[in-house]
């Protein structure tokens, strides 16, 4: 049997309906049997955990996610084994794998396999400080969001008018959220404040910064 | 050598029924996958039923689902077509085939012609 | 449903000729495509399966072609046994259809 499934990767937010499309083409015997697997990220597809089966005529959900799974079409046998997950979680992000036999269609190994995102808005990040917060010091700002897929990107923003720092005193991170302010002086000080950003929405904390004279500095 | 023979056709008045019978012989009847395809007079063909090669699944297009039922008796190497509420649109000749392991018909009947009419 | 449309309906050629028929399939249906022959008359005959197969028996001037939606069949030189009417049926997903035939006849 030779199974088809989209080339392209599928995405879905969180909460949705997630359709993992899978079709063949074969005269459907007595002796037809789907079965539906998930894998992990990052694990081998030898690890796979099976989540339904259809064979004699029977639909056999399975596992942690059977009250979420269906088939599009029930029974399979037109050609037609798309796979329905309800209310997707994080842990649905991975690969599925659809397996369809079919004796004596031995044309192929009958798998396709569809690498599944649940699309997850970023969660209100941590923002935190650490370094020298003296005029002259340095001092590194950090943001990040425990959740948050595709994994969001940062950005820093200053709240208020100050004048603009000198080049190469304020440099960002996008990708690990880190804000770097060198030669600090007392108009560094203020609020700071870092929106965490990917396609499903945004999220923001804030922080402000005190830059002392050399003989003390703290962070409030 | 692979035979299939139809038989059962005839004049049938608007909401009538029929059944058809093709006997299939020369080859294992049992493992193969069946079909009836039909064709109305000067017309392209139609397929209308198939089933699976123990008689577990059955399909059908939208044009004739709930008046027409496919079924086989392995036994007997036979594959029947028991069409009910006839309408004037279903006279065609009706072929009987066997699917190869992809669905695609590899050996055809000589038909049987099914006329609807009052 | 996928529908399958043929062009052109006729065609007229002479013996020795070079005759293409093509088959469109409304959406993709990788190679799963028979194409079938048929005299007035009598049953259809299998020539080509998944696109391009040509069954034990079929002569080796009829060849197949093409996958997605756009298909043609061929027949390489045309034989006075070859006029008839030519059929593609998609065998992908449940119904499987057909095109509505191609009459080559004599030019």
């Known amino acids: 049997v030779e199974v088809k499934v989209p080339t392209e990767p599928l995405s879905t937010p969180l909460g949705k309906t997630a359709e993992l499309t899978c079709t063949y083409s074969t005269s459907v015997g007595d002796s037809f049997a789907l079965e539906w697997s998930f894998v992990q990220p990052g694990k081998p597809i030898s690890e796979s955990h099976p989540i339904l089966y259809f064979t004699n005529g029977h639909l056999y959900p399975t596992g942690s996610k059977s009250k979420r799974v269906s088939l599009l079409q029930n029974p399979p046998t037109v050609g037609v084994a798309t796979l329905k997950l309800t209310d997707v979680h994080p842990s649905d992000t991975g690969t599925y794998l659809c397996q369809v036999n079919n004796p004596p269609d031995f044309y192929t190994n009958g798998l396709g396999l569809i690498n599944l995102t649940v699309l997850v808005p970023p969660s209100n990040p941590l923002c935190s400080q650490s370094g020298q917060t003296s005029v002259g010091g340095s001092t590194a700002l950090r943001c990040s969001s425990s959740e948050g897929a595709p994994k969001p990107v940062y950005n820093w923003v200053r709240l208020g008018t100050f004048p603009t720092p000198s080049p190469g005193s304020m440099v960002q991170d996008e990708v690990s959220g880190q804000l770097i302010l060198t030669n600090l002086s007392l108009t560094s000080s203020g609020t700071y404040r870092c929106v965490a950003t990917n396609q499903m929405g945004s999220a923001s904390c804030e922080l402000t910064l005190s830059v002392t004279e050399p003989s003390q500095g703290r962070v409030a | 050598e692979v035979q299939l023979v139809e038989s059962g056709g005839g004049l049938v008045k608007p909401g009538g029924s029929l059944r058809l019978s093709c006997a299939a012989s020369?080859?294992?009847?049992?493992?193969?996958?069946m079909s009836w395809v039909r064709q109305a007079p000067g017309k392209g063909l139609e397929w209308v039923s198939s089933i699976s090669d123990g008689g577990l699944y059955t399909h059908y297009p939208d044009s004739v689902k709930g008046r027409f039922t496919i079924s086989r008796d392995n036994a007997k190497n036979s594959l029947y077509l028991q069409m009910n509420s006839l309408r004037a649109e279903d006279t065609a000749v009706y072929y009987c085939?066997?699917?190869?392991?992809?669905?695609?018909?590899?050996?055809w009947g000589q038909g049987t012609l099914v006329t609807v009419s009052s | 449903d996928i529908q399958m449309t043929q062009s052109p309906s006729t065609l007229s050629a002479s013996v020795g000729d070079r005759v293409t028929i093509t088959c469109r399939a409304s959406e993709n249906i990788y190679s799963y495509l028979a194409w079938y022959q048929q005299k007035p008359g009598k049953a259809p005959k299998l020539l080509i399966y998944n696109a391009e197969t040509l069954p034990e028996g079929v002569p080796s001037r009829f060849s197949g072609s093409g996958s997605g939606t756009e298909f043609t069949l061929t027949i390489s030189s045309l034989q006075p046994d070859d006029f008839a009417t030519y059929y593609c049926?998609?065998?992908?997903?449940?119904?499987?259809?057909f095109g509505q035939g191609t009459k080559v006849e004599i030019k």
């Open positions: 085939a066997r699917q190869g392991v992809r669905p695609f018909f590899d050996y």
């Open positions: 049926q998609h065998h992908y997903v449940i119904p499987w259809t």
């Open positions: 020369g080859f294992t009847f049992s493992n193969s996958g």
